[in-house]
């Protein structure tokens, strides 16, 4: 799997999409997990509804929400109020039994807010009380890592 890069601005919402073959993954729940190191496990962040027929319902865990268009074959993850600590490697997964197939490897990059030098009164930051439905989603910038780019750079 190539790694797709999604860039979002700090404080805003980032939408990550993971397309898949709807027939191949028919009846399978999906999950979004965070990769812990190059060889480490992928730690589950949020998964779709327990009942596959209700996969389109938005499920959330903290500031992360997931919804699955099972007929169209697109899993969508929304990271709300993006923070620097959200940056890192993730996976979209298709679950079957205790196994998980990787649908897409994702690198989330968090960009500094270009407006953060302005008076805070000029800024709009989604409040905790605001719903995912109301949150503004910044159109994400995505690209695949180029040949030779190292997803996990060696640590010194």
């Amino acid at each position: 799997h190539n790694t797709t890069v999604f860039q979002g601005v700090e404080g805003q919402s980032l939408q990550v999409s993971c397309p898949y073959d709807s027939m191949k993954h028919w009846g399978r729940r999906k999950a979004w997990c965070r990769q812990l190191g190059e060889k480490g496990p992928c730690q589950r962040v949020v998964s779709t509804h327990n009942l596959w027929l209700l996969s389109f319902l938005r499920r959330r865990n903290g500031s992360t929400a997931i919804t699955d268009d099972t007929l169209g074959g697109t899993l969508t993850i929304t990271l709300r109020n993006l923070q620097p600590h959200d940056a890192g490697f993730y996976q979209c997964q298709s679950l079957h039994g205790s196994e998980a197939d990787t649908l897409r490897k994702v690198l989330v990059e968090v960009l500094a807010d270009p407006l953060d030098h302005r008076d805070a009164g000029d800024l709009w930051v989604p409040g905790e009380s605001e719903s995912f439905e109301d949150a503004h989603v910044e159109h994400s910038i995505s690209r695949s890592l180029l040949e030779g780019e190292i997803p996990f750079p060696p640590t010194s």
Epitope: W26, N50, L57, L71
Partner: antibody, heavy 126, light 106 residues
Framework: EVQLVESGGGLVQPGRSLRLSCTAS????????MSWFRQAPGKGLEWVGF??????????EYTASVKGRFTISRDGSKSIAYLQMNSLKTEDTAVYYC?????????????????WGQGTMVTVSS | DIQMTQSPSSLSASVGDRVTITCQAS??????LNWYQQKPGKAPKLLIY???NLETGVPSRFSGSGSGTDFTFTISSLQPEDIATYYC????????FGGGTKVEIK
């Protein structure tokens, strides 16, 4: 008139099988998720399972206590949903209802059940 | 699994009274909650869906509110025909009902 009518209930011995039918009329049956519920005498409501619309290739889901024993199916040409109950237990004794899931669009529905049948009594006893 | 705690289990009120029933979820269920009315010997009837939406044809004296873990169902002015048992139903986790609230007339 939108209507659901259940049939097939009765007295059955533990370990035996029974098939319930739910005949729909007054709406496009294939477009809706159909569900089965039950209510033991004097008790509350329990979801049994449901079967997806034609768009979802009649995919089924069940509550844990009936998984592997009960099977939901549908026949679009007859507008009938079925509940096949095998290896019946005394605790399966209840009034069984079929119900229609509320539909928002071709793909989206909500598990709010807006049309119900009158129910059919199933008694499992030796 | 999510537990739905409905209270009270029964209540008695006079015609014209405002009646309130609560449903508490063991964890956040967003607004994934419906309310039903069931009269003795009859099938349940959908009254409120998605926590606060009134089902078509249901009298406006019925209403629902809440989100997260705490939900409220209200009959603004109790009528004799409202004698029934009322159930909440969540669909955030699976499909689970509360224990029911039996409403009687004083």
């Amino acid at each position: 008139e939108v209507q659901l009518v259940e049939s097939g209930g009765g007295l059955v011995q533990p370990g035996r099988s029974l098939r319930l039918s739910c005949t729909a009329s007054g709406f496009t049956f294939d477009d809706y998720t159909m569900s089965w519920f039950r209510q033991a005498p004097g008790k509350g409501l329990e979801w049994v399972g449901f079967i997806g619309s034609k768009a979802y290739s009649a995919t089924t889901e069940y509550t844990a206590s009936v998984k592997g024993r009960f099977t939901i199916s549908r026949d679009g040409s007859k507008s009938i949903a079925y509940l096949q109950m095998n290896s019946l237990k005394t605790e399966d004794t209840a009034v069984y209802y079929c119900a229609r899931g509320k539909r928002y669009s071709y793909t989206y529905w909500t598990p709010a059940f807006d049309v119900w049948g009158q129910g059919t009594m199933v008694t499992v006893s030796s | 699994d999510i537990q739905m705690t409905q209270s009270p289990s029964s209540l008695s009120a006079s015609v014209g009274d405002r009646v309130t029933i609560t449903c508490q979820a063991s964890q956040d269920i967003t607004n994934y909650l419906n309310w039903y009315q069931q009269k003795p010997g009859k099938a349940p009837k959908l009254l409120i869906y998605d926590a606060s939406n009134l089902e078509t044809g249901v009298p406006s004296r019925f209403s629902g509110s809440g989100s997260g873990t705490d939900f409220t169902f209200t009959i603004s002015s109790l009528q004799p025909e409202d004698i029934a048992t009322y159930y909440c139903q969540e669909y955030d986790s699976y499909i689970t009902f509360g224990g029911g609230t039996k409403v009687e007339i004083k």
